[in-house]
């Protein structure tokens, strides 16, 4: 049979040829004519056999990391017979490892983020080096990690490459560190190869700084004319933290007047002092308020850094503004009876200069021919007023400062014209009545109603009567219905169209005013030739035709 041991070739041999071993048949006693042959991938190129002895040589430099074993075939032939002495056999040449590869950090670049102020022992990142050498071959690929740069803040576990924090770090002092890790093979023994990698370790922010006002006193000014909601200035605190941890909220800590507010501009992290109520220079020309600032987000475990909020004092000076005159009332309502003579007193308006100089005031009425105002604010009539023409007047009174005619204020003044009983009641419409020749006594000829242009304080009540002459000789009579209407009735039987075709009745209508007024109203009554039914319709039709120029038979 074949006789051989395991074949090994050290990689990276610099000699032109290296004896690997010898193929031998146990039938070969040295005196036989045995020829050995080598076949397979690498035979004749990487490996050469001395066919006379069976000695195998490697003639190329081998790289185990490229190829770690070769599978070849061996033959042995007796040249005297040309026959195989042994069956062809497969054998392996293993390339043995030498420490020719340094550790490499394949996952470079390394970057890690760890919160500032993390305690000792906090895991940062694990770096791993790879060594292409044979891990089963001694210590060629057994690595030890060490820290070349990064003390005293970091440490590395020698066998795992785990980087840990060894000293607390403050991001506000330094926000990133370059750590250099070395990996050595041969577990660091002499002849070891090494590789290094750089790790960028960034400290992430924790909220370990409270915001602090840049100034202990701020001086702001506000115009007394500023409307509510006006921004009167900004205050600013600084926070050494970043991002969310530097977001802050400003608030009022003291403001007895409750005149101001502070809102936070979350983009600029400024506090904006806002006017909550209007200020009046003449009332109070300066204010003192205290503001405080706190972080928006604070973790419970970091509360120790935020125990006392930073405060600042804000002095606010009110700036005087030349203000327009100020009326005592926002509007006035005056009353005056109608029919009073011109020059009658209506009422007095009053405006003053709110500023300290107290300018005299001049008054005027905008576009009015009915009223006048003097420099004392007294309003009088320029004409007699008729309530039945206009019961209300809406005036615009303007007050102008004498020292600064641009300072003007206007207010509405409403003048109500009060009623007096200066109108008698009268027919509510024109009445045209008809009576048949054959009408009987007591027949209703017309219902009448009245109106009065005067205003009724309570309710109008009208009294209807025939005039004295009509009462004495009337063919008609009147009945007051006591509801501001009355009915006219025939006071006889039969009428003669030929003799008296039309009657004119004078009706007296009195109101219940004080004093009472009475008017005389004429009612025209036409006598008609009626049909047997006593209908006045035909009579009314005839009247219509006559009024239109037609004659009826």
């Amino acid at each position: 049979g074949w006789v051989w041991n395991q074949f090994f070739v050290p990689e990276e041999m610099n000699t032109t040829s290296h004896h690997v071993g010898r193929l031998r048949s146990d039938l070969d006693n040295g005196n036989n004519s045995f020829q050995y042959k080598l076949l397979g991938a690498g035979a004749g190129s990487t490996f050469i056999i001395d066919e006379r002895t069976g000695d195998i040589y490697a003639i190329e430099k081998l790289d185990r990391e490229e190829r770690s074993l070769y599978i070849l075939r061996a033959q042995v032939i007796d040249i005297t017979t040309g026959r195989a002495v042994e069956p062809e056999s497969e054998f392996v040449i293993k390339v043995s490892d030498i420490n020719d590869n340094e550790p490499k950090f394949l996952d470079e670049p390394y970057e890690a983020i760890v919160p500032e102020m993390s305690p000792e022992g906090t895991l940062v990142i694990q770096v791993t080096a790879s060594d292409a050498d044979d891990p089963s071959s001694g210590n060629n690929a057994r690595l030890l990690y060490s820290l070349l740069q990064g003390q005293p803040y970091f440490s590395v576990e020698p066998t795992t490459g785990v980087i840990r924090i060894s000293s607390k770090m403050d991001r506000e002092l330094q926000d990133e560190y370059w750590v250099i890790i070395q990996a050595k093979d041969m577990i660091g023994q002499p002849g070891a190869l090494s590789g290094t990698t750089s790790v960028l370790i960034k400290l992430s922010d924790v909220n370990d700084n409270k915001p602090i006002f840049k100034e202990s006193l701020y001086r702001l000014t506000v115009s007394e004319s500023a409307p509510t909601g006006t921004s009167i200035g900004t205050i600013m605190a600084y926070d050494n933290d970043i991002g969310e941890n530097a977001e802050m909220d400003y608030s009022i800590e003291e403001d007895d007047s409750q005149t101001f507010d502070i809102i936070t501009n979350h983009e600029t992290q400024e506090g904006i002092v806002i006017l909550k109520k209007k200020v009046n220079f003449e009332h109070q020309n300066h204010y003192g308020i205290r503001a405080k600032v706190k972080n928006h987000h604070v973790d419970k475990q970091l509360m120790k850094y935020h125990t006392e909020a930073s405060t600042t004092f804000i002095k606010i000076q009110v700036e005087d503004v030349d203000e327009p005159p100020l009326f005592l009332l926002p509007y006035y309502i005056f009353e005056i009876f109608e029919e009073t003579p011109q020059g009658s007193f209506v009422g007095v308006v009053s405006a003053t200069d709110p500023d300290n100089r107290k300018s005299p005031i001049r008054y005027s009425i905008t576009r009015s021919k009915v009223f006048n105002i003097d420099d004392n604010g007294t309003i009088t009539t320029t004409n007699s007023l008729d309530r039945e023409i206009s019961a209300w007047y809406n005036l615009s009174i303007t007050a102008t400062e004498k020292y600064n005619i641009e300072q003007i204020s206007s207010i509405p003044v409403y003048v109500q014209v009060l009623n007096i009983n200066d109108h008698a009641p009268e027919f509510s419409q024109y009445y045209e009545s008809y009576v048949c020749e054959n009408a009987g006594s007591g027949q209703v000829i017309q219902t009448i109603s009245a109106v009065d242009r005067d205003e009724s304080i309570e309710e109008h009540h009208f009294y209807f009567n025939l005039s004295v002459e009509d009462t004495n000789s009337s063919s008609f009579t009147i009945i007051d219905n006591q509801d501001n209407t009355a009915v006219i009735l025939t006071n006889r039987t039969g009428f003669n169209l030929q003799e008296e075709p039309i009657f004119y009745i004078s009706i007296l209508i009195a109101d219940n005013g004080i004093p009472s007024l009475t008017s005389t109203n004429t009612l025209t009554i036409h006598v008609c030739d009626c049909d047997d039914s006593g209908s006045t319709q035909t009579c009314q039709y005839q009247e219509l035709m006559l009024s239109m120029g037609f004659k009826t038979e």
Epitope: T16, S17, H19, G30, N31, N32, S33, Q35, I48, D50, E51, R52, T53, D55, Y57, I59, I79, T80
Partner: antibody, heavy 120, light 108 residues
Framework: QVQLQESGPGLVKPSETLSLTCTVS????????WSWIRQPPGKGLEWIGY???????NYNPSLKSRVTMSIDTSKNQFSLTLSSLTAADTAVYFC??????????????WGQGTLVTVSS | EIVLTQSPGTLSLSPGERATLSCRAS???????LAWYQQKPGQAPRLLIF???SRATGIPDRFSGSGSGTDFTLTISGLEPEDFAVYHC?????????FGGGTKVEIK
């Protein structure tokens, strides 16, 4: 045309070591077997051994204990060292080319030979 | 090892004569792996025949080889003046390689 040339000392003292070099010209040393043969004065030829270009050697059992051969392909040279010399080692030493790969072959070409005398 | 015996030790012939040299092996030589060399005084041997019967390049055809197993013959059909020399046989069928003691062909 391949030519071989032996070189070395002509005279060596007994018990010393002989070192001879054969320089190959006109062709490459690689791919061939190279032999040393000696011929004592007035006697027949004796094969000393060969060296293959890869460094493999095979020596005549009668001399094996005293012989070492080496090869330097970069210089196109191969060498013979023979230790513990006696007068019986006095001979003309030839270098010759054997075959290329495979079984033994005849010798061709030969160097012209160099006479080595072992004498005190 | 294979011992080769050459006979005769000396062969005295005249030019033009036929020379027959014998080489006997102590055991069979594999595949007729036998060579013949010619050596003149002060010179290196020169290959004549290999494989028992094949002429080397440039060798005149008056030289011929024959034989197998243990008996081998070198024949020079008509000796030329330059043919007078010592002739060696060598077997290369087994290790170690061995030479015969040589036959000297001299002018009669």
């Amino acid at each position: 045309q391949v030519q071989l040339q032996e070189s070395g000392p002509g005279l060596v003292k007994p018990s010393e070591t002989l070192s001879l070099t054969c320089t190959v010209s006109g062709g490459s040393i690689s791919g061939y077997y190279w032999s040393w043969i000696r011929q004592p004065p007035g006697k027949g030829l004796e094969w000393i051994g060969y060296i293959y270009y890869i460094g493999s050697t095979n020596y005549n059992p009668s001399l094996k204990s005293r012989v070492t051969m080496s090869i330097d392909t970069s210089k196109n040279q191969f060498s013979l060292t023979l230790s513990s010399l006696t007068a019986a080692d006095t001979a003309v030493y030839f270098c010759a080319r054997d075959g290329s790969s495979g079984w033994y072959r005849w010798f061709d070409p030969w160097g012209q030979g160099t006479l080595v005398t072992v004498s005190s | 090892e294979i011992v080769l015996t050459q006979s005769p030790g000396t062969l005295s012939l005249s030019p033009g004569e036929r020379a027959t040299l014998s080489c006997r092996a102590s055991q069979s030589v594999s595949s007729s792996y036998l060579a013949w060399y010619q050596q003149k005084p002060g010179q290196a041997p020169r290959l004549l025949i290999f494989g028992a019967s094949s002429r080397a390049t440039g060798i005149p055809d008056r030289f011929s080889g024959s034989g197998s197993g243990t008996d081998f013959t070198l024949t020079i059909s008509g000796l030329e003046p330059e043919d007078f020399a010592v002739y060696h046989c060598q077997q290369y069928g087994n290790s170690p390689l061995t030479f015969g003691g040589g036959t000297k062909v001299e002018i009669k």
